[in-house]
């Protein structure tokens, strides 16, 4: 018996087609992805093959203005239209709190939404009962297939699930649910979830009875043969894990942003054992036409986005200096504003010993692309912020050793004075540079804001200590020459859309007046430009 698994993960509100790098589509003939194009390919496969499941491994939420405006209603609507068979909850599904998950998505989805390792308690338990499930048995042709869900147990640090959801260890929570499926005589079981490729592989190895793992969170691109676009494969598709009980378990993921449709064919014997598995992600490029009816629906929903982007979010009473003359040479108040917003967006009081789990932010000055003039009645709109942050990136959470941070700050000024983008803007950090010293030895003071303290204060950076830092995904991926971050990071979790983080902060504050306040200093007066 053959099953075709179509899968997406980490779509992050890319409902419309995008450019090759998943940013805004400019030249339509070279654009990719989007739900209209996805639907064309899915329908083509459904017509051609008998037993097809379309699965999503979480993080549909967060990533473009679509989510900012529609808050998840767009996810339910278009996933229903595409007839997704099941979805696992990702960490970003909790970005607007539990209510922001329940009302727009859990109550509106016509397909099962799954997670076995999230347990509700207190008053939430009855409110959320039945709206998501640990597993679902799906009828596929004359057979049944069990889908069991899982979600990153780091979600309380990455999103806003509140205090009434407990995130258990994935493997511990999955095993009893898989066992339950076995007692129901379900002998073909897919683990569908959102904990990253390393955990996907562990689940394949450790959870008895799981036949296939379909994952997300780590944006992992797997491919067998010559890859069709810019993404470099982390391994073959499917990635085969030998389980502790000796079975070969295929593990798949389909990069992110709806650029690819994962396509996996599994052959089962009559006892539900995997005989063979093969496939590859399908690049959703312009050779696949966009479905006209879904496209028309997208265009109808789009109207509200255009109206939103010109509405006032809040006001500034000071000039927001995002000029390259400032932000690539010295502390600029636009950099301070963005870093403050980044920290504010990551406030999570999960431990009494810590005022917050993260206090530090770094931001490449080259990523700040425009100032905002206060002499327009102080008005700040989404459109204004899109000029400041035009690349459609995310502000991510990483863990780094102090020694890596020191290298990053040395890199920040290693060729100072050439208006290059690697000059770092900061939050929760005080840095002093001496430009009279040779490159690689210019950081003379680096103090960081404590987290395990009731009164935050600045202490010298410790080389061997592990620190959490919020930074643009561009830096986490080694951009602007920050190879040491990419090479040495200990953990990396994708965060919220950059513009959304700043817009939420401005809306919350109502009136802003960021200052230049001595976060970045130069000794020997080498800062004159």
């Amino acid at each position: 018996w053959e099953l075709t698994i179509l899968h997406t993960n980490d779509v992050h509100s890319r409902l419309e087609q995008t450019s090759e790098d998943s940013s805004k589509c400019v030249n339509a003939s070279r654009c990719m992805g989007g739900v209209a194009r996805l639907f064309t390919k899915v329908q083509q496969i459904r017509r051609a093959e008998p037993n097809v499941l379309l699965l999503d491994a979480g993080d549909q939420y967060q990533g473009t203005i679509w989510f900012t405006v529609y808050k998840g209603a767009e996810v339910a609507h278009f996933m229903n239209a595409l007839r997704y068979d099941a979805m696992a909850l990702g960490n970003h599904e909790f970005d607007n709190g539990v209510e922001g998950l329940i009302e727009p998505l859990l109550k509106e989805a016509k397909f099962p939404i799954l997670s076995a390792n999230i347990k509700a308690k207190g008053p939430l338990a009855s409110q959320i009962s039945g709206l998501y499930l640990p597993y679902k048995v799906l009828p596929v042709g004359d057979e049944v297939v069990g889908i069991v869900g899982y979600t990153s147990k780091e979600t309380p640090f990455l999103s806003n699930p509140g205090t009434n959801l407990v995130f258990e260890d994935e493997i511990t929570a999955l095993q009893p649910e898989v066992d339950k499926l076995k007692t129901l005589n379900v002998n073909k079981i897919i683990a569908l979830g959102h904990s990253g490729f390393e955990m996907d592989k562990l689940i394949a190895q450790k959870v008895r009875g799981v036949d296939v793992v379909v994952g997300g969170h780590s944006n992992t691109f797997l491919y067998t043969g010559n890859p069709p676009s810019k993404e470099v494969p982390a391994g073959k598709y499917p990635f085969i894990v030998t389980s502790d009980d000796g079975r070969k378990v295929p593990v798949v993921q389909a990069y992110a942003f709806g650029k690819y449709l994962g396509y996996l064919k599994i052959e089962f014997d009559e006892r539900g054992n995997v005989i063979s598995s093969h496939g590859n992600p399908i690049l959703l490029n312009s050779s696949i036409p966009e479905d006209p009816s879904i496209k028309a629906d997208i265009n109808k929903w789009r109207i509200k986005l255009d109206n939103y982007s010109t509405q006032e979010l809040g006001k500034t009473i000071v000039y927001l200096d995002g000029s390259s003359q400032s932000c690539r040479f010295r502390e600029c108040n636009m950099g301070n504003l963005i870093c403050d917003a980044m920290i504010n967006n990551n406030l999570r009081h999960t431990d009494e010993m810590f005022w917050n789990h993260v206090s530090m932010c770094i931001l490449n000055g080259g990523g700040i692309r425009s100032p905002i003039d206060e002499r327009n009645n102080g008005t700040i709109t989404w459109e204004n912020l899109a000029a400041v942050l035009p690349f459609g990136g995310t502000f991510d959470l990483v863990q780094l050793k102090g020694s890596t941070l020191k290298k990053a700050f040395e890199h920040s000024v290693h060729r100072y004075g050439q208006s290059t983008g690697e000059f770092l803007q900061v939050g929760g950090i005080h840095v002093v540079y001496d430009l009279s010293r040779k490159p690689g030895d210019r950081v003379v003071k680096l103090d960081v804001l404590c987290t395990k303290c009731r009164v935050p204060s600045y202490d010298p950076l410790k080389m061997d200590e592990v620190y959490k830092v919020i930074l643009p995904n561009f830096l986490a991926n080694g951009g602007d020459g920050f190879q040491m971050i990419k090479d040495e990071l200990l953990r990396h979790d994708s965060g919220d859309q950059d513009i959304n983080v700043v817009s939420t902060y401005i809306s919350k504050m109502k009136v802003i007046y960021p200052a230049v306040e001595g976060r970045i200093k130069f000794s020997h007066h080498h800062h004159h430009h």
Epitope: E108, K110, P112, K136, P139
Partner: nanobody, 124 residues
């Protein structure tokens, strides 16, 4: 809390009719596919009819085709099973079941929520 409650069962003569109701609470009916199952003494539970979440698709077991009609009233959060030309072999406990999914199925294991059942006895 999701609950399904069947009613309308009873004793009826062969050739007679009954209308079973399945009242749903704790969720909006329009997102759920509803199946009717029955279990006769000493036999396995079997699917008799089903209506998809959109209401656009209905299924019937061969043994009841032409005699049973399934319908839904989303406003009342209720699904009905109109049973005509009843036969003694229709005697069973009738259960309604729900699953959040688009498609009909007669497979017991795909349904997530079940009612307690209502007894239908066809006898002269």
């Amino acid at each position: 809390q999701v609950q399904l409650q069947e009613s309308g069962g009873g004793l009826v003569q062969p050739g007679g009719s009954l209308r079973l109701s399945c009242a749903v609470s704790g969720f909006a009916l329009d997102y759920y596919t509803i199946g009717w199952f029955r279990q006769a003494p000493g036999k396995e539970r079997e699917g008799v009819s089903c209506i998809s979440s959109s209401g656009g698709s209905t299924n019937y077991a061969d043994s009841v085709k032409g005699r049973l009609t399934i319908s839904r009233d989303n406003a009342k959060n209720t699904v009905y099973l109109q049973m005509n030309s009843l036969k003694p072999e229709d005697t069973a406990v009738y259960y309604c079941a729900a699953q959040r999914y688009y498609y009909c199925s007669d497979k017991v294991e795909v349904y997530d929520y079940w009612g307690q059942g209502t007894q239908v006895t066809v006898s002269s």
